[in-house]
Structures are given as structure tokens and as C-alpha cells.
Interface confidence: low
């Protein structure tokens, strides 16, 4: 299709070489009332069409994205050629940064409902460059945490080294939806709730004498609880003795609950006490069996291929530890009678 009629938007993605970050493009199709790009031969700006098939990014989920090769080859369907770019409804997600993402991206509706819709498309010229500004050492991260129940803020990474007074007007989006009230370089959250989690996008306009473009950054925000003040607790085994059958295989499970920690280094291991000896057992890897906002339950099993008489004289000890402290639970095996 002919892309000469598409509206054009220029965007700049300055990525940090220090961190992983993502980027998004929205399919900002113009609204019929505002623009001559859609239905341009049919409506004056004040007229309203009988049906409005394209009402901007809020209602539009069925769009097609293309990339325009720089060598003049035909448009390429994003989904077929670029595995690191994912389409979600009308948003294009770039999972990895890199100058190779520079280029022209075109979106348009999949369903062309009338000949007037042919030019209903947007061309986004994306320039990607690594961040060179070493003067801003403490720019905001592209991954930011908000502490539940307290006050917090979300900073626009590309503007975090500027004071609020210097900062240009910023347009914020959360999960693709415009946050019309927010216009400064950081969003202050008076009280953090779970629903503040999500993907935030901040845009501002930069200009030179020739043209203007949108500088965009993406921030992944997660809501977290405060670091636990408790050492982990062992949920299983509960009993300190376990009835077993000699000669049979046996699996003993150790399940422990670890409270949330931003820097999380859980330890869960089995060791055996036999008279004065104590040694760690190489057992299968630990696995997380339940993870919530507040805590994580981790399980590690010890497997005995056959229970022997000697095992009855041993203590099997599960040891768990976080940054606060450690807990142990020992199990003595007892032969089943009858």
C-alpha cells in the first residue's frame, strides 16, 4: 500500500548501556474529527461521520505493523521478521535495546472498511542511540519499585537529572493509556497500591531549528512490600519424627516461607547428623512452589533410594536462611511397626 499519505511521527530512544530496558511504539492513528489523514475526502473537521471505525489507540486493537527497509525494498511484516519485537494489541514492544532498532515503522488497521481508510496509517521514524551523557550519573532506572502503603514517585529516566522547574511538559502513559493529569517529569504517588504496578511511558518534545521529535522512555514499575523483618519459617516437615518402612524409597520434603526481600538470596539445604558427624547432602535443586507479593514458598527434597537401619540412627536436618537469620527443623526416622 502507498504510505505517502501516512501521518509521520519522529521518536528518539536513548538507551542506557548499563541496564536492560524495553521500548514501545503506540499505533496513534489520528481521530477522524481531528485529522485529514482518515476520511479526508469525506469530512470537514467539524463533521462527524456516520460510523467512526478508527478512534485512536483506545479502541483500536486490530492493527498491522510493518518495517520499511532502508534500501527501498517492500514493507516487511514485523511478526515474521523480528523475533525481539512483540505486538500486543496496538502497541509494539521492543524487548532489547540497540541501534539496529532504528528505522521506520508503519501501522495501519487490518480491516480496511472503506476506500477512505486506505490512508489511515501512521509512520514512526525511530532513532535509537546509546546514552552518552556521562554527567548524569544517577539517572532514574527503567525498573522502579514502589513500596506498598507508602508515598513514592515514578521518574522519567530521560529527564531525571533535570529539576522540576527546568523540565519540559511530559506526557505519561500507563499500560498504553494516557494519564492526562500528569505533566511533570515525575509522578508522585501519595499512597502506593497494587494497581500502581505496570508499564509507564514518558514522552516529551525536543526541537532544533529544523524539526521536532518525541523523546520516549519506558519504565517498568512494580509494587513491593517492605523487606521482611523475619527469618524464614519452615512449613514442612512439621513433626520431628517420621514413620518409615525399611528397604523402601523415601522422599522428605522441606518447604519454607521466605518473606519478601529486594535483594533475595534464600538458602534451603539438607544435612545429616550421624553421631558426631554432620554433612550436607547433595539433593535435587530447590524450586519455588508459590510466589506472592509478600512471600515465596521454596521446596527442596531429600531422596533416599532405600531406607536402611543406619538411617534410623541419623537426624535429617533442613536448614533455611535469609538475610535476617536461619531456622532448622530436624526429622528422626522411626520404623513402622506391623
Amino acid at each position: 500500500f502507498n504510505i505517502s499519505g501516512c501521518s509521520t511521527k519522529k521518536l528518539l530512544w536513548t538507551y542506557s548501556t548499563r541496564s536492560e530496558e524495553e521500548f514501545v511504539l503506540f499505533c496513534d492513528l489520528p481521530e477522524p474529527q481531528k485529522s485529514h489523514f482518515c476520511h479526508r475526502n469525506r469530512l470537514s473537521p467539524k463533521q462527524v461521520p456516520e460510523h467512526l471505525p478508527f478512534m485512536g489507540s483506545n479502541d483500536l486493537s486490530d492493527v498491522q505493523w510493518y518495517q520499511q527497509p532502508s534500501n527501498g525494498d517492500p514493507l516487511e511484516d514485523i511478526r515474521k521478521s523480528y523475533p525481539h519485537i512483540i505486538q500486543d494489541k496496538c502497541t509494539l514492544h521492543f524487548l532489547t535495546p540497540g541501534v539496529n532498532n532504528s528505522g521506520s515503522y508503519i501501522c495501519r488497521p487490518k480491516m480496511i472498511k472503506s476506500p477512505y481508510d486506505v490512508a489511515c496509517c501512521v509512520k514512526m521514524i525511530l532513532e535509537v542511540k546509546p546514552q552518552t551523557n556521562a554527567s548524569c550519573e544517577y539517572s532514574a532506572s527503567h525498573k522502579q519499585d514502589l513500596l506498598l502503603g507508602s508515598t513514592g514517585s515514578i521518574s522519567c529516566p530521560s529527564l531525571s537529572c533535570q529539576s522540576d522547574a527546568q523540565s519540559p511538559a511530559v506526557t505519561w502513559y500507563k499500560n498504553g493509556k494516557l494519564l492526562s493529569v500528569e505533566r511533570s517529569n515525575r509522578i508522585v504517588v501519595d499512597e502506593v497500591y497494587d494497581y500502581h504496578q505496570g508499564t509507564y511511558v514518558c514522552d516529551y518534545t525536543q526541537s532544533d531549528t529544523v524539526s521536532s521529535w518525541t523523546v520516549r522512555a519506558v519504565v517498568q514499575v512494580r509494587t513491593i512490600v517492605g523487606d521482611t523483618k523475619l527469618k524464614p519459617d519452615i512449613l514442612d516437615p512439621v513433626e520431628d519424627t517420621l514413620e518409615v518402612e525399611l528397604g523402601k524409597p523415601l522422599t522428605i520434603s522441606c518447604k519454607a516461607r521466605f518473606g519478601f526481600e529486594r535483594v533475595f538470596n534464600p538458602v534451603i539445604k539438607w544435612y545429616i547428623k550421624d553421631s558426631d558427624l554432620e554433612w550436607e547432602v547433595s539433593v535435587p535443586e530447590a524450586k519455588s512452589i508459590k510466589s506472592t507479593l509478600k512471600d515465596e514458598i521454596i521446596e527442596r527434597n531429600i531422596i533416599l533410594e532405600k531406607v536402611t537401619q543406619r538411617d534410623l540412627r541419623r537426624k535429617f536436618v533442613c536448614f533455611v536462611q535469609n538475610s535476617i537469620g536461619n531456622t532448622t527443623q530436624s526429622v528422626q526416622l522411626k520404623e513402622k511397626r506391623g
Epitope: L148, G149, S150, T151, V189, D190, E191, Y193, D194, Y195
Partner: antibody, heavy 117, light 112 residues
Framework: SVEESGGRLVTPGTPLTLTCTAS????????MTWVRQAPGKGLEWIGF?????SAGYASWAKGRFTISKTSATVDLRITGATTEDTGTYFC???????????????WGPGTLVTVSS | AAVLTQTPSSVSAAVGGTVTINCQSS????????LAWYQQKPGQPPKLLIY???TLASGVPSRFKGSGSGTQFTLIMSDLECGDAATYFC????????????FGGGTEVVVK
């Protein structure tokens, strides 16, 4: 548990401070709120103080009440009592239930304030 | 400021019967479900029955059932017992820029 104290008979215009003391939990780890109830009437939310120390108020309560805290207590100051302030004042612990927000889970027995000339 | 309207203001039912109390909010509560129900008996402080619109608080019997979201909420009490005679209040949590919490006017439940 939570317990309020400081309720008494005062004349209109008198400032009055009510104190809330907690036992069995650390008051500094929870948001705490004040709720009042006029005799035979419904409950009215006054305001809260966050674990971090910042306070929030119902619009009608701004300027009429001040909530503050020490390491062991939460105080409600009635700046200048009026007869409409007569009622039982409850101090309540708030708990965070997840994505929808906070609720009032642990209530004190209340302290009675009577404002009369 | 948000207003919670509770209906009816008073209701009477027999032991073993069922009572329904409605709570309508003038604006949507936080996350569509930041609504709680409290029970208050004479001379006592209120007690939390239900939070998140439908989650039973610890120790509350399953005869109490909360439902609804956004602006319309309902408390249904079935298999009524004499001990259920009390005043019931709904309470909502709202956007951080507005009155943060509001209570309904209360419903007096009489069990005969």
C-alpha cells in the same frame, strides 16, 4: 489490642487531645485511623496517620483535628471543641489487604468526649 | 466527597431467615472492590466482617456473604441467629485525592 484515653467533659472552644496506645503489635508498622460516632448515630471517618508519619483527613475534618504520633502512641487533637464533637472516638488499626487498599481491622473500645456549656 | 447510601435503615427478620442490605456509593471505590462491612452491637466497637467486597474476615461464619463491585454492593445474611442482631455499616476506600474513606449510614437488624 488498641486502647483510647483522654475523653472527658469539656466546654465549647476547649482544645482536647485523645491518645491511642497499642499492645501486641508495633504501632509504627501500621497506618492508624480515627473514627467517631455521635450518640445513637453512624460512624464518621476523621483521618489517619501513615506508618511513616504523614496524616490525611476527611475534608470536613481538616483544620478541626490534628493527628500526630510518637513511637508508642497516636494522638488526635480537637483544636476547639464544639457541641457537634460530642461522641465516642475510636482509634483503629488499618491493614493492607492487597490491590484494593486498606481496611479497619482492630478497633479500640472508644473514649467518650462530651462537649457542653 | 464520596457518599455511601445504605438501605434499608432498619430491617426485621425471624431466626433462620435472610436479610439483604444494600450499599450504594456516589463514586467507584478503589480498584472497584475497596469496600468493607462492619457489625456493631450496642456498647461495643464495630467488628470487621467482610473486606474486598466479598472476602470474609477471620472467624466470620459463611452465613455472611458480600458481593458487588464499583458502586453497588450487597450484604446477605442467611440462617439468622439472635446474636446477629446489630447495626451493620458499609465503608468504602476512595481515590487518594478525595476523602479517603466514607461510612454508610448503617442498617439496624432486628432478629425476632
Amino acid at each position: 489490642s488498641v486502647e483510647e484515653s483522654g475523653g472527658r467533659l469539656v466546654t465549647p472552644g476547649t482544645p482536647l487531645t485523645l491518645t491511642c496506645t497499642a499492645s501486641g503489635f508495633d504501632i509504627n508498622n501500621y497506618h492508624m485511623t480515627w473514627v467517631r460516632q455521635a450518640p445513637g448515630k453512624g460512624l464518621e471517618w476523621i483521618g489517619f496517620i501513615k506508618a511513616g508519619g504523614s496524616a490525611g483527613y476527611a475534608s470536613w475534618a481538616k483544620g478541626r483535628f490534628t493527628i500526630s504520633k510518637t513511637s508508642a502512641t497516636v494522638d488526635l487533637r480537637i483544636t476547639g471543641a464544639t457541641t457537634e464533637d460530642t461522641g465516642t472516638y475510636f482509634c483503629v488499626r488499618m491493614f493492607y489487604a492487597g490491590d484494593s487498599g486498606h481496611y479497619f481491622d482492630l478497633w479500640g473500645p472508644g473514649t467518650l468526649v462530651t462537649v457542653s456549656s | 466527597a464520596a457518599v455511601l447510601t445504605q438501605t434499608p435503615s432498619s430491617v426485621s427478620a425471624a431466626v433462620g431467615g435472610t436479610v439483604t442490605i444494600n450499599c450504594q456509593s456516589s463514586q467507584s471505590v478503589n480498584n472497584a472492590k475497596n469496600l468493607a462491612w462492619y457489625q456493631q452491637k450496642p456498647g461495643q466497637p464495630p467488628k470487621l466482617l467482610i473486606y474486598d467486597a466479598s472476602t470474609l474476615a477471620s472467624g466470620v461464619p459463611s452465613r455472611f456473604k458480600g458481593s458487588g463491585s464499583g458502586t453497588q454492593f450487597t450484604l446477605i445474611m442467611s440462617d439468622l441467629e439472635c446474636g446477629d442482631a446489630a447495626t451493620y455499616f458499609c465503608a468504602g476506600g476512595y481515590d487518594r485525592f478525595i476523602d479517603t474513606f466514607a461510612f454508610g449510614g448503617g442498617t439496624e437488624v432486628v432478629v425476632k
